[in-house]
Interface confidence: low
C-alpha cells in the first residue's frame, strides 16, 4: 500500500541502491519513487551532519522485506517511496530553495530580474535540469541577478552548498509547464545518431519513449524492433542526447523506430507506467515470486500490489496451469526493464502499474511522524 | 481572493470552478477534487440555486477566460448536502458533488489529500486559500486563479472577532489581524490547504466572513477533519470501496 509518513531523526541502515544530492527530503522521496528498485530513502539535511560530503545526501534503498532497521540520527529524515500512491506520483517539483547553491554543469548564464524568471528560463531550455540564481543582495556585485542554467549526468546536483543570497530549483518540465512543446511523431525506419545515455530492453517504441521521457538526460531515442537484423540488438531502446538538443543526423534504417522525449510537452505528459499487455511475449528477469492466478489481468494486478515487482509473465503452458489458474511470474531487474524479451511463447507479459497515477489504489495516509 | 497573486499552471490541481449555465454562464463557487468522481464544496453554494442539470464543473483550468463552449466540463450526478446544514447558520457548510463521469488525473487535475479524522494535533504553518472570487468587497470574479498565504487563527481568537456568531470546533479560521488578505465572494466552497511534511492537505472549505479582508475579521472555513466520517460514509460505493482519496 501507500505509505507517506516521514520519520524524523531516523536513518535506514543498509539496503543502499543509489545515492545523490537533493535539496530536501521531498525531492529525495520523489527520486526514490521513480527509481526502479528504491522502496525506502534517508536524507541528511545540512544541519544534521558535519561531513561536508554527506550534507544534502539522499540515499535510496531497497529491501527484500520492504523495511530496514531504523537508527536514530538527529536531523535525518527517512521515508517510503510513493510507488503505489496513485495521484501523488509526480516528477514535478516546484519548490525554490533559498540560501542553497545546486552545483552542476553551468551551460548558460543570463541576467534576470527574479528567481521565478530564472526557473522559467530553465523550464524553457531543453537541456536545463536545475538552476541557481544570485539575488540582488549577493555579495559579489558582478554576479547579482545571474541565472545559471545547469545539468548533470544523473539529473541531480553534483553537490549542494549552503550559500547566502542564492536561490536554486528544478526545471518545471515534469510539471508539463514547458513552453518548448514536443514532437509526438514516431519515425518508422529511421535511426538517430548522437550520444547514447542508456540502453534498455522494451517490447515496443512507446515504452521506449516513456522511459526516455522520465530519464533525466534522454532527449530522443531509437528503438530496434524484434525483427531487427542483429539478434542481440532486438528490442533494444537506446536513450540519446546531443549538445544541440536535437539529433545531429538520422539514417533511414529498416526495422528501427525513433522519436523524442515528451518531457517538453505542454499541458500533458505520459504516465510513468506502461499498462499494455503483450501477448506471446516472455519478459525475463530476476524471479521475485510465482503464484497461480486466474487470468493475465489478475497477474498484472498481483504484480502491481507487490511493490518490488516491476514486470511479469503469465504462462499458459499446460504444465503451468491448474484448472482455471496459471502461473504468474513476478519479476524485477536492476533498471526496471526486462533483461530479455522472447517472442512466440504461450503466455503474455506486461509491467507493474505501481507508478500509474490514475489508479484508485492510492490513499493519502496521515499517520503521524515517528520521533 | 483579496491580497493574492496569480497562480501558475498545475499549482493547485484540485481546484475546480463550479459554474451555472442559465441565460449566461458564470462562476459561482470553488470546490476541491478529492477523488476521480468527487468534489468537496460548501453547502451554501446551492442555497436557492438551480440544482444538478444547470451546474458545470470545470477542472484543470487556470484562467476562466480560456473557457469556451468547447471546453470540457463535468456534470453533476448527485449533490449531497450535509444533513445538519441550515441556511440560517454557518454550521455544517459542506457538500459533496458526485460527478456523472470519473475524471482522469493529470498534472493539472488531481485530488487533494484529506486530513485524518479529528486532526487537532497537527500545527499547520503554511496555509493557502485559492479561488477566482472577488479581489475586493465590491469587486468582480477574477480571470486567473488567485492564491494567498494566510495564517490559521485559533477558534478562541476567532470567536472574539465574531460575537454575533458561534464559532464551533467544526470551523477553522484564517486571517491577519490587520486584514488585507482573505477569501471573498466567489471563493466559497474552495480550498484552504496547508502543506505539512511535504504534502498538501485540505484543511478547510471557504465558508463565510464579515466583508472581505477586514481588520480583525478572519475568514471562517468548514474544518474538513471534523467531517471525515461523513465524507467517507457518503463516498462509499456499493462495493464498499472508497471513491476518493481518504486517509488510511
Amino acid at each position: 500500500g501507500c505509505l507517506t509518513q516521514l520519520y524524523e531523526n531516523a536513518f535506514f541502515r543498509g539496503g543502499d541502491v543509489a545515492s545523490m544530492y537533493t535539496p530536501n527530503a521531498q525531492y529525495c522521496q520523489m527520486r526514490c519513487t521513480f527509481h526502479p528498485r528504491c522502496l525506502l530513502f534517508s536524507f541528511l539535511p545540512a544541519s544534521s551532519i558535519n561531513d561536508m560530503e554527506k550534507r544534502f545526501g539522499c540515499f535510496l534503498k531497497d529491501s527484500v522485506t520492504g523495511t530496514l532497521p531504523k537508527v536514530h540520527r538527529t536531523g535525518a529524515v527517512s521515508g517510503h517511496s510513493l510507488k503505489q500512491c496513485g495521484h501523488q506520483i509526480s516528477a514535478c517539483h516546484r519548490d525554490i530553495y533559498k540560501g542553497v547553491d545546486m552545483r552542476g554543469v553551468n551551460f548558460n548564464v543570463s541576467k534576470v530580474s527574479s528567481v521565478e524568471e530564472c526557473q522559467k528560463r530553465c523550464t524553457s531550455n531543453i537541456r536545463c535540469q536545475f538552476f541557481s540564481y544570485a539575488t540582488q543582495t549577493f555579495h559579489k556585485a558582478e554576479y547579482r541577478n545571474n541565472c545559471l542554467l545547469k545539468y548533470s549526468p544523473g539529473g541531480t546536483p553534483t553537490a549542494i552548498k549552503v550559500l547566502s543570497n542564492v536561490e536554486s530549483g528544478f526545471s518545471l518540465k515534469p510539471c508539463a509547464l514547458s513552453e518548448i512543446g514536443c514532437h509526438m511523431n514516431i519515425f518508422q525506419h529511421l535511426a538517430f545518431s548522437d550520444v547514447d545515455v542508456a540502453r534498455v530492453l522494451t517490447p515496443d517504441a512507446f515504452v521506449c519513449r516513456t522511459i526516455c521521457t522520465y530519464h533525466p538526460n534522454c532527449l530522443f531515442f531509437t528503438f530496434y524492433t524484434n525483427v531487427w537484423k542483429i539478434e542481440s540488438q532486438r528490442n533494444v531502446c537506446l536513450l540519446k542526447t546531443s549538445e544541440s538538443g536535437t539529433p545531429s543526423s538520422s539514417t533511414p534504417q529498416e526495422n528501427t523506430i525513433s522519436g523524442y522525449s515528451l518531457l517538453t510537452c505542454k499541458r500533458t505528459l505520459p504516465e510513468p507506467c506502461h499498462s499494455k499487455i503483450y501477448p506471446g511475449v516472455d519478459f525475463g528477469g530476476e524471479e521475485l515470486n510465482v503464484t497461480f492466478v486466474k487470468g493475465v489481468n489478475v497477474c498484472q494486478e498481483t504484480c502491481t500490489k507487490m511493490i518490488r515487482c516491476q514486470f511479469f509473465t503469465y504462462s499458459l503452458l499446460p504444465e503451468d496451469c491448474k484448472e482455471e489458474k496459471c502461473k504468474c511470474f513476478l519479476r524485477l531487474s536492476m533498471d526496471g526493464s526486462p533483461t530479455r524479451i522472447a517472442y512466440g511463447t504461450q503466455g503474455s507479459s506486461g509491467y507493474s502499474l505501481r507508478l500509474c497515477n490514475t489508479g484508485d489504489n492510492s490513499v493519502c495516509t496521515t499517520k503521524t511522524s515517528t520521533r | 481572493i483579496v491580497g493574492g497573486t496569480n497562480s501558475s499552471w498545475g499549482e493547485w490541481p484540485w481546484q475546480v470552478s463550479l459554474q451555472v449555465k442559465l441565460t449566461a454562464q458564470r462562476h459561482l463557487c470553488g470546490g476541491s477534487l478529492i477523488g476521480h468522481q468527487w468534489v468537496l464544496t460548501a453547502a451554501h453554494c446551492f442555497d436557492g440555486l438551480p440544482l444538478q442539470d444547470v451546474w458545470r464543473i470545470y477542472s484543470g483550468i487556470l484562467n476562466l477566460s480560456d473557457i469556451t463552449k468547447d471546453t470540457p466540463f463535468s456534470q453533476i450526478k448527485e449533490i449531497i448536502i450535509h444533513q445538519n446544514y441550515k441556511v440560517s447558520e454557518g454550521n455544517h457548510d459542506i457538500a459533496l458533488i458526485k460527478l456523472q463521469a470519473p475524471l482522469n488525473y493529470t498534472e493539472f487535475q488531481k485530488p487533494i489529500c484529506l486530513p485524518s479524522k479529528g486532526d487537532t494535533s497537527t500545527i499547520y504553518t503554511n496555509c493557502w486559500v485559492t479561488g477566482w472570487g472577488f479581489s475586493k468587497e465590491k469587486g468582480e470574479i477574477q480571470n486567473i486563479l488567485q492564491k494567498v498565504n494566510i495564517p490559521l487563527v485559533t477558534n478562541e481568537e476567532c470567536q472574539k472577532r465574531y460575537q454575533d456568531y458561534k464559532i464551533t470546533q467544526r470551523m477553522v479560521c484564517a486571517g491577519y489581524k490587520e486584514g488585507g488578505k482573505d477569501a471573498c465572494k466567489g471563493d466559497s466552497g474552495g480550498p484552504l490547504v496547508c502543506k505539512h511534511n511535504g504534502m498538501w492537505r485540505l484543511v478547510g472549505i471557504t465558508s463565510w466572513g464579515e466583508g472581505c479582508a477586514r481588520r480583525e475579521q478572519p475568514g471562517v472555513y468548514t474544518k474538513v477533519a471534523e467531517y471525515m466520517d461523513w465524507i467517507l460514509e457518503k463516498t462509499q460505493s456499493s462495493d464498499g470501496k472508497a471513491q476518493m482519496q481518504s486517509p488510511a
Epitope: - | R26, L49, L51, V87, I141, W208
Partner: antibody, heavy 122, light 106 residues
Framework: EVQLLESGGGLVQPGGSLRLSCAAS????????MMWVRQAPGKGLEWVSG????????VYADSVKGRFTISRDNSKNTLYLQMNSLRAEDTAVYYC???????????????WGQGTMVTVSS | DIQMTQSPSTLSASVGDRVTITCRAS??????LAWYQQKPGKAPNLLIY???TLESGVPSRFSGSGSGTEFTLTISSLQPDDFATYYC????????FGQGTKVEIK
C-alpha cells in the same frame, strides 16, 4: 435597520415601458441574491426575476422572458427591473426581496420591501 | 418548470384549532421549500425555510415537515393573529410559489 424601498410604479398603457427601482440599506447589498416577485390584485405570489450577487447571472419566469430585464448597481445598493412591452396581465404589486438568512457570504431569501403598484391599462 | 400545488385553497377554522396545509411539488425538490404568511396589503413574511427550519422570531406553534414532493405546514393552536394567506415556495430550481391557502375565521 434593514430596508428595501421600491419605487417607479404607476399607470402605463399596454405596450409601454416602466423602470422599477429598489433601494437597499442596512446590509451588504453586493453579497446577496435579489429578486422581484409580483402579486396581481386578489391573486397569489409569482416570482418574476432574480439576479445573483455579482450581477452576472440573471433568471426570469417564462411569463416575462424577453420583455423584462433585471439589473443591479452594487455601488448604489440599488436593484432595477426594466419592463418593456407591458400587458394588462402584468398589473400587480411588485416586491423586491433579498435573501438575508444566515451568516455573511450567504445567499438565501426572505426580506421583502413593501411593494410598488404597476397598472397596465388603456 | 416545477409546479407547486397547495391545498386547500381556503380553510375555515377557529382559534385553538390545529391547522394543516399541504404543498405538493411536481418533482422532487429535496428540502428546498419555504412557507410564507401574508396579510392583506402587506409583504409576505417568512415562517419556515428548508422545509422545517423555523425562522427566528416566528412562534413555535408553526412547524414544517416533508421532503421530496410532499410538504406540510402545521399551526398547532391557531391564534387570532394567524388568520392570513399562506404560501409555499420551492427554491430548488428557480423559484415558484404555490397558489396560496387562505385561513379564515369559521
Amino acid at each position: 435597520e434593514v430596508q428595501l424601498l421600491e419605487s417607479g410604479g404607476g399607470l402605463v398603457q399596454p405596450g409601454g415601458s416602466l423602470r422599477l427601482s429598489c433601494a437597499a440599506s442596512g446590509f451588504t447589498f453586493s453579497h446577496y441574491i435579489m429578486m422581484w416577485v409580483r402579486q396581481a390584485p386578489g391573486k397569489g405570489l409569482e416570482w418574476v426575476s432574480g439576479i445573483y450577487s455579482s450581477g452576472g447571472i440573471t433568471v426570469y419566469a417564462d411569463s416575462v422572458k424577453g420583455r423584462f430585464t433585471i439589473s443591479r448597481d452594487n455601488s448604489k445598493n440599488t436593484l432595477y427591473l426594466q419592463m418593456n412591452s407591458l400587458r394588462a396581465e402584468d398589473t400587480a404589486v411588485y416586491y423586491c426581496a433579498y435573501r438575508r438568512i444566515g451568516v455573511p457570504r450567504r445567499d438565501s431569501f426572505d426580506m421583502w420591501g413593501q411593494g410598488t403598484m404597476v397598472t397596465v391599462s388603456s | 418548470d416545477i409546479q407547486m400545488t397547495q391545498s386547500p385553497s381556503t380553510l375555515s377554522a377557529s382559534v385553538g384549532d390545529r391547522v394543516t396545509i399541504t404543498c405538493r411539488a411536481s418533482q422532487s425538490i429535496s428540502s428546498w421549500l419555504a412557507w410564507y404568511q401574508q396579510k392583506p396589503g402587506k409583504a409576505p413574511n417568512l415562517l419556515i425555510y428548508k422545509a422545517s427550519t423555523l425562522e427566528s422570531g416566528v412562534p413555535s406553534r408553526f412547524s414544517g415537515s416533508g421532503s421530496g414532493t410532499e410538504f406540510t405546514l402545521t399551526i398547532s393552536s391557531l391564534q387570532p393573529d394567524d388568520f392570513a394567506t399562506y404560501y409555499c415556495q420551492q427554491y430548488n430550481t428557480y423559484w415558484t410559489f404555490g397558489q396560496g391557502t387562505k385561513v379564515e375565521i369559521k
